[in-house]
Interface confidence: medium
Amino acid sequence: KETAFVEVVLFESSPSGDYTTYTTGLTGRFSRAGATLSAEGEIVQMHPLGLCNNNDEEDLYEYGWVGVVKLEQPELDPKPCLTVLGKAKRAVQRGATAVIFDVSENPEAIDQLNQGSEDPLKRPVVYVKGADAIKLMNIVNKQKVARARIQHRPPRQPTEYFDM
């Protein structure tokens, strides 16, 4: 289980039309459910229940986004429509280039994601928890334009990335 280095970039548009970027670094883990690859895309926050409906067009975005899913306590969803792995697959089917799970409320999901699949996803499936998850969700909950860059080595200077 390698460390995933995640950079989250919040874009603030200025009156002149330029963008100022605010970069937050955090770490997670690549799970065995997916590939240990770099990925980058606009963040789309997804509700775990929103991944249940097979023909739900609300979440059909252009290919290349990074899905962020905060998993709920298992007691709140005793009969989930899909396993955590199934939810990751559903997000990738809908065009996610990577999926990040906040497992803080549901640490059992870590084992589910790391059980190893005969057919792992070809895109990264990362999990975060604790302070890193809080940092991520604080940004995501703003509902403003943000991008995530996932790498399997520590990032260099953030200025090298996100060239507008």
Epitope: S13, Q45, M46, Y61, Q143, K144
Partner: antibody, heavy 121, light 109 residues
Amino acid sequence: EVQLVESGGGLVKPGGSLRLSCAASGFTFSDYGIHWVRQAPGKGLEWVGRIKSKTDGGITEYAAPVKGRFTISRDDSKNTLYLQMNSLKTEDTAVYYCARAIYYLEAFDVWGQGTLVTVSS
Amino acid sequence: DIELTQPPSVSVSPGQTASITCSGDSLGSYYVHWYQQKPGQAPVLVIYRNKQRPSGIPERFSGSNSGNTATLTISGTQAEDDADYYCAVWDDEPHHDVFGGGTKLTVLG
């Protein structure tokens, strides 16, 4: 069919109270955050407030003009949302809509037909 | 707090392209949603998250958002598009929804 149906509107005197209801059907009501939006006659849309789903904490938030006077609640067992309006003012006269928010995105993909509240002496 | 400004009215001939703007400080940082409302009816979501179209909304509706301006574009405008259009964003400080003042789109003829 996914739908929201408001009821409870009517004529009320300034300073009076009224409770609006919003009955949901065709979807799992408890999973969604629901908002109230109003529209004064001949005017634009104005956000009133919202209540998150229970799993998201059931938190309520309100627009400044109604804070302290209006209360949003929900009864998931009845698939019903409520808006309790107290200390009503003439400027609260409007059609009141309930609207369902797309998960984690405060865009309203399902709206009720609206119910008219008239505050007048 | 962000304030959203829309032109009160826009006119277009059938078959032409209509553009309705929504402006606000640093609007490009926000996700903008667009609603259509016909007289006596509830609003209908036509674009969300700047450019996403809900199922059932015709492909002629599209959206963009950059800098201080978001734009709803209706290409090949039809008579049934004659309506009021509102832009909206969710402002996170404090949490509340903000609507633009609305634009009356008139399809001529």
